[in-house]
């Protein structure tokens, strides 16, 4: 006569983070007496799941009730499954004796935890920088299982190709990370665009999750000034006009200069946008040209976002 | 679902006897056979257990004397060197105690050891 | 060996009595609930009522029930029926698996 078999029917089960994993077990005698008990592991390390015959197993429940005369089904349930939940699983039928002996055990079931990703998380640079510069972001996603993930970027709906991607770690653990950096060229236009870090995963559901990043937080578009006379308001006085254009962001401090000496100071208030979102903004300063016996030089400085001041600067003739 | 048993009489002290338990209704190849026996007036006591793949155990006053085997269907039960208090009626019994209790019992089959 | 001690060795009680039969174990059964009862009348074979020390056998009156763990159990009927008087046994078993012994039994008899 044969004797007592362990028939564990399921070389792999998977189940999603949360949920209840069901691990088959069943034996072909009620002979020898003694419990079954499931283990994780194999080996002296292996961790004790369950025990028929005693102890406190909260998150395992019987499918069969263990109790009931005939029962040689000794699957369980294992609840709220976590990645650390991941690895071989062996049902175990032991002999009664001081102690227990292992009499025959199951070949195994090895059990995978579909994890999601959490939400990518995209950062850019520390600093600003300014057009045709090139800056690096980075996006970061964990917690995942298996394994596979893709990772995509796009800017404004563009799919970039220039990134290089790392998914940790290399070998086996319960679960992994992925961290991408993208390099992108910032253009004039860039400050209503975005960059998209895109994760697809098998957990997912081709739904995939997006990071993102305004690149109104990391460009600065400096301005161009341009110095104007206005035609002569009154006898002895004359308007000249600073146009600030196309900058970003709207932090700017502009000084007015008469011959080197400071005449005014401002900061950009009422500003328009642009359809690019960029600013543009316009000072102007009334010259009392009857207190110049000199031609005087006259000079808009600009300070744009804690930056170097950048200047334009008018000679006013002032006629005899 | 039963077990009948056969094989009791009259021996003399010395003597062997083999004892049957036929089943019906379901299959021994999953399922250990228990012998216990009860002397005339005296209370129940485990002789011994038959398992499969020659799995077998006895009370230790059994060992050596009483030997157990099975089929799918029939389990046996040889007694050797009987004695005058091995005078009993044996049952046999579906089970092997703890979580697999004795739940079908036959009708017993009276043993008597006497000269 | 395990030595299990039933109490008490017989009882008379009358019909819609609670009945409660103790057994004692020399040491702590296997896995603090070795333990089964069976009740036997005069010329039949024993019957299987509880094992597990508490788990109802199937077709067995829900009147009776058993409790307890590791050395000392219990076996009670709660409203004696007619059909009840008989012997009871408890068979408990050691960590041994060559290890079980049923106690002295005990006579449920008519007042």
């Known amino acids: 006569e044969e004797e007592l078999q362990v028939i564990q029917p399921d070389k792999s089960v998977s189940v999603a983070a949360g949920e209840s994993a069901i691990l088959h077990c069943t034996v072909t005698s009620l002979i020898p007496v003694g419990p079954i008990q499931w283990f994780r592991g194999a080996g002296p390390a292996r961790e004790l799941i369950y025990n028929q015959k005693e102890g406190h197993f909260p998150r395992v429940t019987t499918v069969s009730e263990s109790t009931k005369r005939e029962n040689m089904d000794f699957s369980i349930s294992i609840s709220n499954i976590t990645p650390a939940d991941a690895g071989t699983y062996y049902c175990v039928k032991f002999r009664k004796g001081s102690p227990d002996t292992e009499f025959k055990s199951g070949a195994g079931t090895e059990l995978s935890v579909r994890a999601k990703p959490s939400a990518p998380v995209v950062s850019g640079p520390a600093a600003r920088a300014t057009p045709q510069h090139t800056v690096s972001f980075t996006c970061e996603s964990h917690g995942f299982s298996p394994r596979d993930i893709t990772l995509k970027w796009f800017k404004n709906g563009n799919e970039l190709s220039d990134f290089q991607t790392n998914v940790d770690p290399v070998g086996e653990s319960v679960s992994y990370s992925i961290h991408s950096t993208a390099k992108v060229v910032l253009t004039r236009e860039d400050v209503h665009s975005q960059v998209i870090c895109e994760v697809a995963h098998v957990t997912l559901q081709g739904d995939p999750l997006r990071g993102t990043a305004n690149l109104s937080e990391t460009i600065r578009v400096p301005p161009t000034l341009e110095v104007t006379q206005q035609p002569v308001r009154a006898e002895n006085q004359v308007n000249v006009t600073c146009q600030v254009r196309k900058f970003y962001p709207q932090r700017l401090q502009l000084t007015w200069l008469e011959n080197g000496n400071v005449s005014r100071t401002e900061t950009a208030s009422t500003v328009t946008e642009n359809k690019d979102g960029t600013y543009n903004w316009m000072s102007w300063l009334l010259v009392n040209v009857s207190a110049h016996r000199d031609d005087v030089k006259l000079t808009c400085q600009v300070e744009h976002d804690g930056q170097p001041a950048v200047s334009k600067s008018h000679d006013l003739k002032v006629s005899a | 679902r039963q077990l009948v048993e056969s094989g009791g009489g009259l021996v003399q002290p010395g003597g062997s006897l083999r004892l049957s338990c036929a089943a019906s209704g379901f299959s021994l190849s999953s399922h250990g056979i228990s012998w216990v026996r009860q002397a005339p007036g005296k209370g129940l006591e485990w002789v011994g257990t038959?398992?499969?793949?020659?799995i077998t155990y006895y009370a230790s006053w059994a060992k050596g004397r009483f030997t157990g085997s099975k089929t799918s269907s029939t389990a046996y039960m040889e007694l050797s060197s009987l004695r005058a208090e091995d005078t009993a009626v044996y049952y046999c019994?579906?089970?092997?105690?703890?979580?697999?209790?004795?739940?079908?019992w036959g009708q017993g089959t009276l043993v008597t050891v006497s000269s | 060996d395990i030595v299990m001690t039933q109490s008490p060795s017989s009882l008379s009680a009358s019909v819609g009595d609670r009945v409660t039969i103790t057994c004692q174990a020399s040491?702590?059964?296997?896995?603090?609930?070795?333990l089964a009862w069976y009740q036997q009348k005069p010329g039949q074979a024993p019957k299987l009522l509880i094992y597990l020390a508490s788990t109802l056998a199937t077709g067995v009156p829900s009147r009776f029930s058993g409790s307890g763990s590791g050395t000392d159990f219990t076996l009670t009927i709660s409203s004696l029926q007619p059909e009840d008087f008989a012997t009871y046994y408890c068979?408990?078993?050691?960590?041994?698996?060559?290890?079980?012994?049923f106690g002295q039994g005990t006579k449920v008899e008519i007042k």
């Open positions: 068979l408990g078993g050691g960590d041994d698996e060559a290890d079980n012994t």
């Open positions: 040491q702590s059964v296997y896995g603090n609930n070795d």
């Open positions: 019994a579906r089970g092997s105690a703890w979580n697999d209790p004795f739940d079908i």
């Open positions: 038959i398992g499969t793949g020659g």
